[in-house]
Protein backbone atom coordinates (compact mmCIF):
# COMPACT_ATOMS: atom_id res chain seq x y z
CA UNK A 1 0.00 0.00 0.00
CA UNK A 2 2.76 2.55 1.22
CA UNK A 3 4.69 1.26 -2.16
CA UNK A 4 1.28 2.40 -4.36
CA UNK A 5 1.10 5.79 -2.51
CA UNK A 6 4.49 6.91 -3.03
CA UNK A 7 4.32 6.15 -6.59
CA UNK A 8 1.19 7.89 -7.26
CA UNK A 9 2.05 10.62 -5.27
CA UNK A 10 5.80 10.90 -6.91
CA UNK A 11 3.79 11.03 -10.57
CA UNK A 12 1.44 13.26 -9.16
CA UNK A 13 3.88 15.43 -7.70
CA UNK A 14 6.15 14.91 -11.21
CA UNK A 15 2.76 16.52 -13.67
CA UNK A 16 2.51 19.50 -11.15
CA UNK A 17 6.18 20.10 -11.70
CA UNK A 18 5.97 19.35 -15.43
CA UNK A 19 2.96 21.42 -16.25
CA UNK A 20 4.64 24.25 -13.96
CA UNK A 21 8.69 23.83 -16.17
CA UNK A 22 6.34 24.26 -19.56
CA UNK A 23 4.25 26.81 -18.18
CA UNK A 24 7.49 28.96 -16.89
CA UNK A 25 9.17 28.21 -20.68
CA UNK A 26 5.93 29.64 -22.03
CA UNK A 27 5.49 32.53 -19.74
CA UNK A 28 6.62 36.08 -21.05
CA UNK A 29 7.86 37.37 -17.25
CA UNK A 30 11.52 35.99 -16.93
CA UNK A 31 12.60 39.41 -16.69
CA UNK A 32 10.33 42.45 -15.35
CA UNK A 33 11.54 45.94 -15.46
CA UNK A 34 12.52 47.59 -12.21
CA UNK A 35 10.42 50.15 -10.85
CA UNK A 36 12.28 50.70 -7.60
CA UNK A 37 15.24 53.62 -8.05
CA UNK A 38 14.82 53.92 -11.77
CA UNK A 39 13.18 56.64 -14.19
CA UNK A 40 9.65 56.30 -14.19
CA UNK A 41 8.72 54.86 -17.69
CA UNK A 42 5.06 55.68 -18.45
CA UNK A 43 5.21 51.89 -20.12
CA UNK A 44 6.18 48.57 -18.08
CA UNK A 45 8.88 46.75 -19.96
CA UNK A 46 9.04 42.56 -19.38
CA UNK A 47 10.97 39.73 -21.66
CA UNK A 48 10.72 35.87 -21.85
CA UNK A 49 12.81 33.38 -23.60
CA UNK A 50 10.69 33.67 -26.45
CA UNK A 51 9.53 37.18 -27.02
CA UNK A 52 9.68 40.93 -25.08
CA UNK A 53 6.52 42.38 -24.06
CA UNK A 54 5.48 45.74 -23.26
CA UNK A 55 2.37 47.09 -21.26
CA UNK A 56 1.52 50.46 -21.37
CA UNK A 57 -0.70 52.42 -19.05
CA UNK A 58 -3.91 51.81 -20.87
CA UNK A 59 -3.63 48.37 -20.18
CA UNK A 60 -2.38 47.16 -23.71
CA UNK A 61 0.13 45.19 -24.24
CA UNK A 62 2.27 44.34 -27.46
CA UNK A 63 4.96 41.63 -27.57
CA UNK A 64 7.72 41.13 -30.24
CA UNK A 65 9.46 37.96 -30.78
CA UNK A 66 12.85 37.23 -31.34
CA UNK A 67 13.01 36.58 -34.90
CA UNK A 68 16.62 35.74 -35.05
CA UNK A 69 18.54 32.45 -33.01
CA UNK A 70 22.42 33.61 -34.71
CA UNK A 71 21.80 37.52 -32.55
CA UNK A 72 20.55 36.29 -29.51
CA UNK A 73 22.97 36.01 -26.21
CA UNK A 74 24.23 31.89 -25.59
CA UNK A 75 23.50 32.07 -22.37
CA UNK A 76 19.72 32.79 -23.45
CA UNK A 77 19.97 29.60 -25.84
CA UNK A 78 21.37 27.55 -23.19
CA UNK A 79 18.46 28.70 -21.33
CA UNK A 80 16.28 27.93 -23.83
CA UNK A 81 17.68 24.20 -24.83
CA UNK A 82 17.86 23.79 -20.63
CA UNK A 83 14.22 24.21 -20.45
CA UNK A 84 13.03 21.97 -23.42
CA UNK A 85 15.28 19.48 -22.49
CA UNK A 86 13.76 19.49 -19.01
CA UNK A 87 10.00 19.43 -20.63
CA UNK A 88 11.10 16.50 -23.47
CA UNK A 89 12.48 14.03 -20.86
CA UNK A 90 9.73 15.27 -18.42
CA UNK A 91 7.23 14.37 -20.74
CA UNK A 92 9.02 10.74 -21.31
CA UNK A 93 9.18 10.09 -18.10
CA UNK A 94 5.46 11.19 -17.51
CA UNK A 95 4.58 8.65 -20.42
CA UNK A 96 6.62 5.58 -18.71
CA UNK A 97 5.67 6.37 -15.48
CA UNK A 98 1.80 5.94 -16.45
CA UNK A 99 2.50 2.67 -17.47
CA UNK A 100 5.04 1.71 -14.57
CA UNK A 101 1.76 2.68 -11.75
CA UNK A 102 0.58 -0.04 -9.49
CA UNK A 103 -2.94 0.47 -10.43
CA UNK A 104 -2.92 0.43 -13.85
CA UNK A 105 -2.50 -3.25 -15.13
CA UNK A 106 -1.23 -3.87 -19.29
CA UNK A 107 -2.12 -7.13 -20.05
CA UNK A 108 0.62 -9.39 -17.99
CA UNK A 109 3.24 -7.10 -17.50
CA UNK A 110 5.93 -8.55 -14.82
CA UNK A 111 6.15 -6.63 -11.56
CA UNK A 112 10.37 -6.46 -12.45
CA UNK A 113 9.25 -4.62 -15.22
CA UNK A 114 7.18 -1.80 -13.74
CA UNK A 115 10.18 -1.38 -11.10
CA UNK A 116 12.58 -0.93 -13.75
CA UNK A 117 10.16 1.81 -15.69
CA UNK A 118 9.14 3.60 -12.13
CA UNK A 119 12.85 3.78 -11.61
CA UNK A 120 13.74 4.76 -15.45
CA UNK A 121 10.60 7.59 -15.20
CA UNK A 122 12.30 8.95 -11.97
CA UNK A 123 15.53 9.39 -12.99
CA UNK A 124 13.96 11.12 -15.94
CA UNK A 125 12.39 13.06 -13.75
CA UNK A 126 14.76 13.97 -11.20
CA UNK A 127 16.97 15.30 -14.85
CA UNK A 128 14.34 17.07 -15.66
CA UNK A 129 14.08 18.97 -12.26
CA UNK A 130 17.45 19.70 -12.60
CA UNK A 131 17.32 21.22 -16.35
CA UNK A 132 14.77 23.60 -15.17
CA UNK A 133 16.38 24.55 -12.04
CA UNK A 134 19.57 24.86 -13.66
CA UNK A 135 18.01 26.58 -16.63
CA UNK A 136 16.22 29.02 -14.36
CA UNK A 137 19.46 29.59 -12.38
CA UNK A 138 21.62 30.35 -15.82
CA UNK A 139 18.94 32.88 -16.34
CA UNK A 140 18.69 34.70 -12.94
CA UNK A 141 22.39 34.74 -12.71
CA UNK A 142 22.24 36.59 -15.83
CA UNK A 143 20.02 38.83 -14.83
CA UNK A 144 21.72 39.78 -11.79
CA UNK A 145 25.26 40.82 -13.77
CA UNK A 146 23.00 42.60 -16.21
CA UNK A 147 21.44 44.75 -13.12
CA UNK A 148 24.65 45.69 -11.40
CA UNK A 149 26.23 46.35 -14.85
CA UNK A 150 23.34 48.66 -15.35
CA UNK A 151 22.88 50.12 -12.01
CA UNK A 152 26.79 51.07 -12.53
CA UNK A 153 25.61 52.93 -15.74
CA UNK A 154 22.23 53.94 -15.76
CA UNK A 155 22.09 56.14 -18.57
CA UNK A 156 24.53 55.02 -21.27
CA UNK A 157 26.07 58.16 -23.35
CA UNK A 158 25.78 58.26 -27.19
CA UNK A 159 28.27 60.57 -28.52
CA UNK A 160 28.91 62.44 -25.08
CA UNK A 161 25.45 64.49 -25.52
CA UNK A 162 22.32 62.10 -26.03
CA UNK A 163 21.42 60.02 -22.88
CA UNK A 164 19.58 56.81 -23.61
CA UNK A 165 17.47 54.92 -20.72
CA UNK A 166 19.11 52.21 -19.25
CA UNK A 167 16.18 49.82 -18.43
CA UNK A 168 17.09 47.59 -15.51
CA UNK A 169 15.46 43.95 -15.35
CA UNK A 170 14.51 42.50 -12.26
CA UNK A 171 13.55 38.48 -11.29
CA UNK A 172 10.00 37.37 -12.96
CA UNK A 173 7.65 35.90 -12.36
CA UNK A 174 8.43 32.76 -14.59
CA UNK A 175 12.05 32.39 -12.49
CA UNK A 176 9.70 31.64 -9.00
CA UNK A 177 7.25 29.49 -11.37
CA UNK A 178 10.62 27.57 -12.76
CA UNK A 179 12.24 27.05 -9.30
CA UNK A 180 8.82 25.78 -7.80
CA UNK A 181 7.99 23.77 -10.57
CA UNK A 182 12.08 22.08 -11.27
CA UNK A 183 11.51 21.38 -7.23
CA UNK A 184 8.78 19.79 -7.68
CA UNK A 185 9.90 17.22 -10.31
CA UNK A 186 13.15 16.37 -8.81
CA UNK A 187 10.98 15.40 -5.43
CA UNK A 188 8.42 13.47 -7.89
CA UNK A 189 11.52 12.00 -9.24
CA UNK A 190 13.18 10.89 -6.46
CA UNK A 191 9.65 9.65 -4.55
CA UNK A 192 9.23 7.22 -7.82
CA UNK A 193 13.12 6.21 -6.85
CA UNK A 194 11.97 4.90 -3.74
CA UNK A 195 8.97 3.29 -4.93
CA UNK A 196 10.97 1.37 -7.57
CA UNK A 197 12.84 0.00 -4.69
CA UNK A 198 9.31 -1.39 -2.65
CA UNK A 199 8.05 -2.77 -6.51
CA UNK A 200 11.14 -4.68 -6.84
CA UNK A 201 10.36 -8.12 -6.27
CA UNK A 202 12.73 -10.28 -4.14
CA UNK A 203 15.39 -12.46 -6.10
CA UNK A 204 16.04 -14.56 -3.37
CA UNK A 205 13.73 -16.74 -1.15
CA UNK A 206 11.94 -15.36 1.60
CA UNK A 207 13.15 -15.85 5.34
CA UNK A 208 11.21 -18.77 6.57
CA UNK A 209 8.97 -18.57 9.38
CA UNK A 210 8.08 -22.34 10.89
CA UNK A 211 5.12 -24.09 12.23
CA UNK A 212 5.76 -26.60 14.54
CA UNK A 213 3.18 -29.51 14.09
CA UNK A 214 2.47 -32.41 16.15
CA UNK A 215 5.14 -35.20 15.21
CA UNK A 216 6.83 -33.56 12.82
CA UNK A 217 8.55 -30.24 11.75
CA UNK A 218 7.41 -28.43 8.24
CA UNK A 219 8.96 -25.30 7.55
CA UNK A 220 6.84 -22.77 4.74
CA UNK A 221 7.39 -20.07 3.67
CA UNK A 222 5.51 -16.89 2.81
CA UNK A 223 4.08 -17.33 -0.82
CA UNK A 224 2.42 -20.21 -1.04
CA UNK A 225 3.07 -23.15 -3.22
CA UNK A 226 5.79 -20.72 -5.35
CA UNK A 227 7.92 -19.64 -2.28
CA UNK A 228 10.46 -22.21 -3.88
CA UNK A 229 10.33 -20.35 -7.17
CA UNK A 230 12.59 -17.42 -5.67
CA UNK A 231 9.71 -15.26 -6.95
CA UNK A 232 6.94 -15.28 -4.45
CA UNK A 233 3.34 -14.86 -5.35
CA UNK A 234 2.16 -12.59 -2.90
CA UNK A 235 2.32 -9.41 -4.59
CA UNK A 236 -0.77 -7.90 -3.25
CA UNK A 237 0.50 -7.38 0.44
CA UNK A 238 -2.23 -10.02 1.81
CA UNK A 239 -2.16 -12.48 4.73
CA UNK A 240 -1.66 -15.82 2.95
CA UNK A 241 -1.69 -17.37 6.67
CA UNK A 242 -3.61 -16.98 9.70
CA UNK A 243 -1.31 -18.66 11.36
CA UNK A 244 1.27 -15.45 12.37
CA UNK A 245 3.49 -15.44 9.11
CA UNK A 246 3.50 -11.81 7.95
CA UNK A 247 3.68 -10.11 5.16
CA UNK A 248 6.02 -9.16 2.92
CA UNK A 249 6.24 -5.39 3.59
CA UNK A 250 6.36 -6.58 7.42
CA UNK A 251 9.24 -8.71 7.10
CA UNK A 252 12.38 -7.77 5.39
CA UNK A 253 14.37 -10.45 3.51
CA UNK A 254 18.39 -11.01 3.25
CA UNK A 255 20.37 -13.09 1.14
CA UNK A 256 20.37 -16.36 2.90
CA UNK A 257 19.48 -19.41 0.57
CA UNK A 258 18.08 -21.86 3.84
CA UNK A 259 17.42 -19.77 6.82
CA UNK A 260 15.06 -22.62 8.56
CA UNK A 261 14.86 -22.30 12.12
CA UNK B 1 -19.17 60.68 -28.30
CA UNK B 2 -16.37 61.21 -26.24
CA UNK B 3 -16.70 64.60 -23.82
CA UNK B 4 -14.60 65.89 -21.20
CA UNK B 5 -15.92 68.98 -19.50
CA UNK B 6 -13.77 71.22 -17.22
CA UNK B 7 -14.94 73.64 -14.46
CA UNK B 8 -13.63 75.39 -11.15
CA UNK B 9 -11.61 77.84 -13.39
CA UNK B 10 -11.18 81.58 -12.61
CA UNK B 11 -9.37 84.49 -10.84
CA UNK B 12 -7.65 83.90 -7.61
CA UNK B 13 -4.61 85.17 -5.32
CA UNK B 14 -1.21 83.93 -5.29
CA UNK B 15 -1.11 81.58 -2.58
CA UNK B 16 -4.76 80.62 -2.89
CA UNK B 17 -6.06 77.46 -3.70
CA UNK B 18 -8.58 76.32 -6.52
CA UNK B 19 -10.04 72.46 -7.47
CA UNK B 20 -11.05 71.73 -10.99
CA UNK B 21 -13.06 69.26 -11.98
CA UNK B 22 -13.39 67.64 -15.27
CA UNK B 23 -17.10 65.66 -15.85
CA UNK B 24 -16.39 62.86 -18.92
CA UNK B 25 -19.21 60.89 -20.54
CA UNK B 26 -18.81 58.83 -24.36
CA UNK B 27 -16.68 55.96 -22.80
CA UNK B 28 -15.86 53.78 -19.68
CA UNK B 29 -13.76 56.51 -17.73
CA UNK B 30 -12.43 53.98 -15.28
CA UNK B 31 -10.72 52.18 -17.53
CA UNK B 32 -8.61 55.15 -18.96
CA UNK B 33 -6.24 57.07 -17.36
CA UNK B 34 -6.38 60.41 -17.01
CA UNK B 35 -3.99 63.41 -17.76
CA UNK B 36 -3.84 67.65 -16.82
CA UNK B 37 -2.25 69.63 -19.21
CA UNK B 38 -2.33 73.45 -19.56
CA UNK B 39 -1.07 76.17 -21.21
CA UNK B 40 -0.06 79.93 -20.58
CA UNK B 41 -1.50 82.74 -22.86
CA UNK B 42 0.67 82.70 -25.65
CA UNK B 43 2.85 79.63 -24.90
CA UNK B 44 3.51 76.17 -25.45
CA UNK B 45 1.48 73.31 -23.95
CA UNK B 46 2.50 71.70 -20.31
CA UNK B 47 1.98 68.76 -18.97
CA UNK B 48 0.42 68.61 -15.15
CA UNK B 49 -0.44 65.65 -14.07
CA UNK B 50 -1.12 61.98 -14.60
CA UNK B 51 -3.39 59.71 -13.03
CA UNK B 52 -3.97 55.89 -13.51
CA UNK B 53 -7.27 54.14 -14.34
CA UNK B 54 -7.32 52.10 -10.70
CA UNK B 55 -5.69 55.55 -9.03
CA UNK B 56 -2.59 53.13 -8.66
CA UNK B 57 0.18 55.49 -10.53
CA UNK B 58 0.43 59.20 -10.12
CA UNK B 59 2.45 61.09 -11.36
CA UNK B 60 2.99 65.29 -11.38
CA UNK B 61 5.46 67.78 -13.04
CA UNK B 62 8.11 69.07 -11.12
CA UNK B 63 6.98 72.31 -11.15
CA UNK B 64 3.30 71.11 -9.39
CA UNK B 65 4.93 68.50 -7.18
CA UNK B 66 3.98 69.11 -3.88
CA UNK B 67 1.29 72.17 -4.56
CA UNK B 68 -1.50 70.04 -6.99
CA UNK B 69 -2.98 66.92 -5.98
CA UNK B 70 -5.06 65.06 -9.10
CA UNK B 71 -8.04 62.32 -8.14
CA UNK B 72 -10.42 61.20 -9.62
CA UNK B 73 -13.97 59.17 -8.74
CA UNK B 74 -14.97 56.67 -11.25
CA UNK B 75 -18.68 56.53 -9.63
CA UNK B 76 -19.21 59.93 -10.49
CA UNK B 77 -17.30 59.99 -13.70
CA UNK B 78 -15.23 62.71 -12.69
CA UNK B 79 -11.18 63.74 -12.73
CA UNK B 80 -10.05 66.67 -10.32
CA UNK B 81 -6.89 69.08 -9.72
CA UNK B 82 -6.35 70.31 -6.38
CA UNK B 83 -4.39 73.13 -6.76
CA UNK B 84 -2.61 74.92 -3.80
CA UNK B 85 0.17 77.94 -3.10
CA UNK B 86 -0.97 79.02 -6.55
CA UNK B 87 1.66 81.00 -8.27
CA UNK B 88 1.46 83.98 -11.12
CA UNK B 89 3.31 81.48 -13.12
CA UNK B 90 0.38 78.52 -12.83
CA UNK B 91 -1.95 81.04 -14.95
CA UNK B 92 -2.98 78.64 -17.77
CA UNK B 93 -5.72 77.29 -19.41
CA UNK B 94 -6.53 73.51 -17.82
CA UNK B 95 -7.06 71.21 -20.33
CA UNK B 96 -8.58 67.87 -18.76
CA UNK B 97 -7.11 65.18 -21.05
CA UNK B 98 -8.10 61.00 -21.87
CA UNK B 99 -4.63 59.03 -22.29
CA UNK B 100 -5.44 57.22 -25.10
CA UNK B 101 -5.39 52.89 -25.24
CA UNK B 102 -2.45 53.37 -27.79
CA UNK B 103 0.95 54.48 -27.85
CA UNK B 104 0.31 56.57 -24.28
CA UNK B 105 -0.98 59.07 -26.49
CA UNK B 106 -3.17 61.83 -25.08
CA UNK B 107 -6.82 61.29 -27.60
CA UNK B 108 -9.56 62.89 -26.59
CA UNK B 109 -8.81 66.94 -25.32
CA UNK B 110 -11.48 69.22 -23.30
CA UNK B 111 -11.86 72.78 -24.23
CA UNK B 112 -9.95 74.09 -20.96
CA UNK B 113 -10.72 76.13 -18.15
CA UNK B 114 -8.85 79.29 -17.50
CA UNK B 115 -6.95 79.76 -14.18
CA UNK B 116 -6.18 83.05 -13.76
CA UNK B 117 -3.39 83.67 -10.66
CA UNK B 118 -3.20 87.34 -9.37
CA UNK B 119 -3.29 90.04 -7.14
CA UNK C 1 13.67 65.41 -17.23
CA UNK C 2 13.52 65.08 -20.99
CA UNK C 3 13.66 67.66 -22.99
CA UNK C 4 12.36 68.07 -26.48
CA UNK C 5 13.29 70.70 -28.64
CA UNK C 6 11.13 71.39 -32.25
CA UNK C 7 12.77 73.16 -35.18
CA UNK C 8 11.97 75.74 -36.89
CA UNK C 9 10.31 77.27 -34.35
CA UNK C 10 8.00 78.57 -37.26
CA UNK C 11 7.91 78.31 -41.35
CA UNK C 12 5.62 80.10 -44.01
CA UNK C 13 4.81 77.63 -47.17
CA UNK C 14 2.55 77.57 -50.47
CA UNK C 15 -0.46 76.12 -50.47
CA UNK C 16 0.55 71.95 -51.98
CA UNK C 17 4.12 72.28 -50.70
CA UNK C 18 5.59 69.74 -48.49
CA UNK C 19 6.98 70.51 -45.27
CA UNK C 20 8.98 68.76 -42.70
CA UNK C 21 9.37 69.82 -39.30
CA UNK C 22 11.91 68.39 -36.61
CA UNK C 23 11.54 67.09 -32.78
CA UNK C 24 14.93 65.88 -30.81
CA UNK C 25 14.58 64.51 -27.69
CA UNK C 26 17.60 64.37 -24.93
CA UNK C 27 16.86 60.78 -24.35
CA UNK C 28 15.64 58.13 -26.51
CA UNK C 29 12.19 57.14 -26.27
CA UNK C 30 12.54 53.87 -28.62
CA UNK C 31 11.29 50.77 -26.20
CA UNK C 32 13.47 47.94 -27.17
CA UNK C 33 10.39 45.48 -25.79
CA UNK C 34 7.68 46.18 -28.71
CA UNK C 35 10.53 48.09 -30.66
CA UNK C 36 8.40 51.74 -30.94
CA UNK C 37 9.48 55.05 -30.20
CA UNK C 38 7.42 56.59 -27.28
CA UNK C 39 6.78 59.75 -29.53
CA UNK C 40 3.22 61.73 -30.11
CA UNK C 41 2.32 64.94 -32.56
CA UNK C 42 -0.27 66.76 -32.05
CA UNK C 43 -2.07 69.60 -34.03
CA UNK C 44 -2.99 72.82 -32.19
CA UNK C 45 -5.27 75.30 -34.40
CA UNK C 46 -5.97 78.76 -32.97
CA UNK C 47 -8.40 79.49 -30.06
CA UNK C 48 -9.11 75.40 -29.75
CA UNK C 49 -7.84 72.63 -27.91
CA UNK C 50 -4.89 70.38 -29.07
CA UNK C 51 -5.69 67.14 -31.67
CA UNK C 52 -3.77 64.15 -31.41
CA UNK C 53 -2.33 63.31 -34.81
CA UNK C 54 0.29 60.50 -34.44
CA UNK C 55 1.71 58.23 -32.14
CA UNK C 56 4.43 55.62 -31.78
CA UNK C 57 6.24 58.41 -33.78
CA UNK C 58 4.33 56.72 -37.48
CA UNK C 59 1.08 55.95 -36.71
CA UNK C 60 -1.73 57.84 -37.60
CA UNK C 61 -5.06 58.35 -35.47
CA UNK C 62 -7.68 57.40 -37.10
CA UNK C 63 -9.25 60.31 -38.83
CA UNK C 64 -6.02 62.17 -39.84
CA UNK C 65 -5.53 62.62 -43.52
CA UNK C 66 -2.63 60.57 -45.11
CA UNK C 67 -0.78 63.67 -46.32
CA UNK C 68 0.35 63.72 -42.29
CA UNK C 69 3.12 61.32 -41.51
CA UNK C 70 5.93 60.80 -38.93
CA UNK C 71 9.52 59.34 -39.01
CA UNK C 72 12.28 58.55 -37.13
CA UNK C 73 13.30 56.82 -34.18
CA UNK C 74 15.33 57.17 -30.43
CA UNK C 75 15.89 60.16 -30.61
CA UNK C 76 15.38 62.17 -33.57
CA UNK C 77 11.70 62.94 -35.54
CA UNK C 78 10.40 64.24 -38.14
CA UNK C 79 6.59 65.22 -38.94
CA UNK C 80 6.06 65.43 -42.85
CA UNK C 81 3.02 67.44 -44.43
CA UNK C 82 2.77 65.96 -48.29
CA UNK C 83 0.65 69.14 -50.08
CA UNK C 84 0.17 71.59 -47.26
CA UNK C 85 -3.78 72.67 -47.04
CA UNK C 86 -5.07 75.77 -45.97
CA UNK C 87 -6.68 74.02 -42.77
CA UNK C 88 -3.22 73.20 -42.07
CA UNK C 89 -2.21 76.56 -40.43
CA UNK C 90 -1.57 75.40 -36.44
CA UNK C 91 1.34 75.27 -34.24
CA UNK C 92 2.24 71.48 -34.25
CA UNK C 93 3.85 70.04 -30.99
CA UNK C 94 5.83 66.90 -30.17
CA UNK C 95 5.73 64.78 -26.87
CA UNK C 96 7.93 62.83 -24.89
CA UNK C 97 5.49 60.11 -23.82
CA UNK C 98 8.00 57.76 -22.41
CA UNK C 99 9.43 58.99 -19.66
CA UNK C 100 7.57 60.76 -16.37
CA UNK C 101 7.59 63.61 -16.13
CA UNK C 102 6.00 63.69 -20.16
CA UNK C 103 7.11 66.69 -21.76
CA UNK C 104 5.96 68.50 -24.95
CA UNK C 105 8.46 69.95 -27.48
CA UNK C 106 7.67 74.12 -27.39
CA UNK C 107 6.01 74.02 -30.78
CA UNK C 108 6.20 74.51 -34.71
CA UNK C 109 4.24 76.99 -36.01
CA UNK C 110 2.75 77.01 -39.54
CA UNK C 111 1.75 79.30 -41.57
CA UNK C 112 0.71 79.78 -45.25
CA UNK C 113 2.96 82.59 -47.64
Known amino acids: MAVTACQGLGFVVSLIGIAGIIAATCMDQWSTQDLYNNPVTAVFNYQGLWRSCVRESSGFTECRGYFTLLGLPAMLQAVRALMIVGIVLGAIGLLVSIFALKCIRIGSMEDSAKANMTLTSGIMFIVSGLCAIAGVSVFANMLVTNFWMSTANMYTGMGGMVQTVQTRYTFGAALFVGWVAGGLTLIGGVMMCIACRGLAPEETNYKAVSYHASGHSVAYKPGGFKASTGFGSNTKNKKIYDGGARTEDEVQSYPSKHDYV | EVQLVESGGGLVQPGGSLRLSCAVSGFTFSSFGMHWVRQAPGKGLEWVAY????????YYADSVKGRFTVSRDNAKNSLYLQMNSLRAEDTAVYYCVRSGYYGQSLDYWGQGTLVTVSS | DIVMTQSPDSLAVSLGERVTMNCKSS????????????LTWYQQKPGQPPKLLIYWASTRESGVPDRFSGSGSGTDFTLTISSVQAEDVAVYYCQNVYIYPLTFGQGTKLEIK
Open chain 2, 51 to 58: ISSGTTNI
Open chain 3, 27 to 38: QSLFSSGNQRNY
